[in-house]
C-alpha cells in the first residue's frame, strides 16, 4: 500500500522539515525560515509560534518542530502548549478576580497556584490535631484521643510555627 501510495502521490515522500512544492512540480522543498513541518507529506509548512512579550522562548523553532513558550517570572503557564500566562500568588493565597488574596481561616494553599483548600478534619478519622494548620500548611493529625489517655505513651505536640492567620476576603 505504501508503495502504491507513493507512486500515486509523490508528496508522501517529502520528509518532516520539507513541504511538497506544487509550484516546482511537487519537489520536496525545505521549509522557509520561521516555519516548520513536523510530519512528512505536508503540502505547506506551518508558521513558527513567536514567544513575544511575557511569553519567553523555552525551545527554539526548528524545521521539524514548533517553538515552545513559557511565562516570564511571576506568572505560570496555562492551557495547551502554554497558550496563557496566569499570575503566581504566594503560598497561603489564592488567585481571584481581585488578584491574590489570603486564604480564609480554616483553609490553606501550599503552592504558588491553585485554590485554598480546607484543613483536614482529623476527627473524621478519629484522630486529634497534632500540629495546627496555617494559611500555608494543612493540619497534622496525630493519634486518636483515646491513645493519649493516661497510661498511654503521651506525645507532646510541637508548638505551631505561628498562629493560623485569618484574613477576610
Amino acid at each position: 500500500f505504501e508503495r502504491t501510495r507513493s507512486l500515486q502521490d509523490p508528496c508522501s515522500n517529502c520528509p518532516a522539515g520539507t513541504f511538497c512544492d506544487n509550484n516546482r512540480n511537487q519537489i520536496c522543498s525545505p521549509c522557509p525560515p520561521n516555519s516548520f513541518s513536523s510530519a512528512g507529506g505536508q503540502r505547506t509548512c506551518d508558521i513558527c509560534r513567536q514567544c513575544k512579550g511575557v511569553f519567553r522562548t523555552r525551545k527554539e523553532c526548528s524545521s521539524t518542530s514548533n517553538a515552545e513558550c513559557d511565562c516570564t517570572p511571576g506568572f505560570h503557564c496555562l492551557g495547551a502548549g502554554c497558550s496563557m500566562c496566569e499570575q503566581d500568588c504566594k503560598q497561603g493565597q489564592e488567585l481571584t478576580k481581585k488578584g491574590c488574596k489570603d486564604c480564609c481561616f480554616g483553609t490553606f494553599n501550599d503552592q504558588k497556584r491553585g485554590i485554598c483548600r480546607p484543613w483536614t478534619n482529623c476527627s473524621l478519622d478519629g484522630k486529634s490535631v497534632l500540629v495546627n494548620g496555617t494559611k500555608e500548611r494543612d493540619v497534622v493529625c496525630g493519634p486518636s484521643p483515646a491513645d493519649l489517655s493516661p497510661g498511654a505513651s503521651s506525645v507532646t505536640p510541637p508548638a505551631p510555627a505561628r498562629e493560623p492567620g485569618h484574613s477576610p476576603q
Epitope: L78, G79, S83, M84, C85, E86, L95, T96, K97
Partner: nanobody, 123 residues
Framework: EVQLVESGGGLVQPGGSLRLSCAAS????????LNWVRQAPGKGLEWVAN????????YYVDSVEGRFTISRDNAKNSLYLQMHSLRAEDTAVYYC????????????????WGQGTMVTVSS
C-alpha cells in the same frame, strides 16, 4: 491577526497623571475580560487591574486602588488606564493583556499581550 498595542507612556513627575491606551484588533473585543499588568525594572510581572466585558466590573491591586482607573470603550476597541498621584514605584513597562476564554470562572490566564509602554515617574 489578534493584536494589542499600548500607547501613552512617558516621563512624568511624582504626583502627576498619565493616561495609557490599548488598541485591540483581530478579535471580538467586547467578549473578553481585559487586564493591565506591569513590570518594574529588574522585577517580575505584577497584575494591576482588570475589567469585565461590558465595563461593569473592575478590580485593582491594593497599591494602585484609588489612584488608577481602568475603563474601556467597546465601540472603539480600546482599553484605558488613567493614572493619578503617580509615584516612583509606579515606574514600569505597562502591558495590556486579554483574559483567555472563561477568564474569571475556571482560571485567570491571559492569552494575548501587547508589546508594552514604558512609564517613568521621576523628578
Amino acid at each position: 491577526e489578534v493584536q494589542l498595542v499600548e500607547s501613552g507612556g512617558g516621563l512624568v513627575q511624582p504626583g502627576g497623571s498619565l493616561r495609557l491606551s490599548c488598541a485591540a484588533s483581530g478579535f471580538t473585543f467586547g467578549s473578553y475580560w481585559l487586564n493591565w499588568v506591569r513590570q518594574a525594572p529588574g522585577k517580575g510581572l505584577e497584575w494591576v487591574a482588570n475589567i469585565n466585558q461590558d465595563g461593569s466590573e473592575n478590580y485593582y491591586v491594593d497599591s494602585v486602588e484609588g489612584r488608577f482607573t481602568i475603563s474601556r470603550d467597546n465601540a472603539k476597541n480600546s482599553l484605558y488606564l488613567q493614572m493619578h498621584s503617580l509615584r516612583a514605584e509606579d515606574t514600569a513597562v505597562y502591558y495590556c493583556a486579554r483574559g483567555g476564554e472563561d477568564y474569571g470562572n475556571s482560571h485567570f490566564g491571559m492569552d494575548v499581550w501587547g508589546q508594552g509602554t514604558m512609564v517613568t515617574v521621576s523628578s
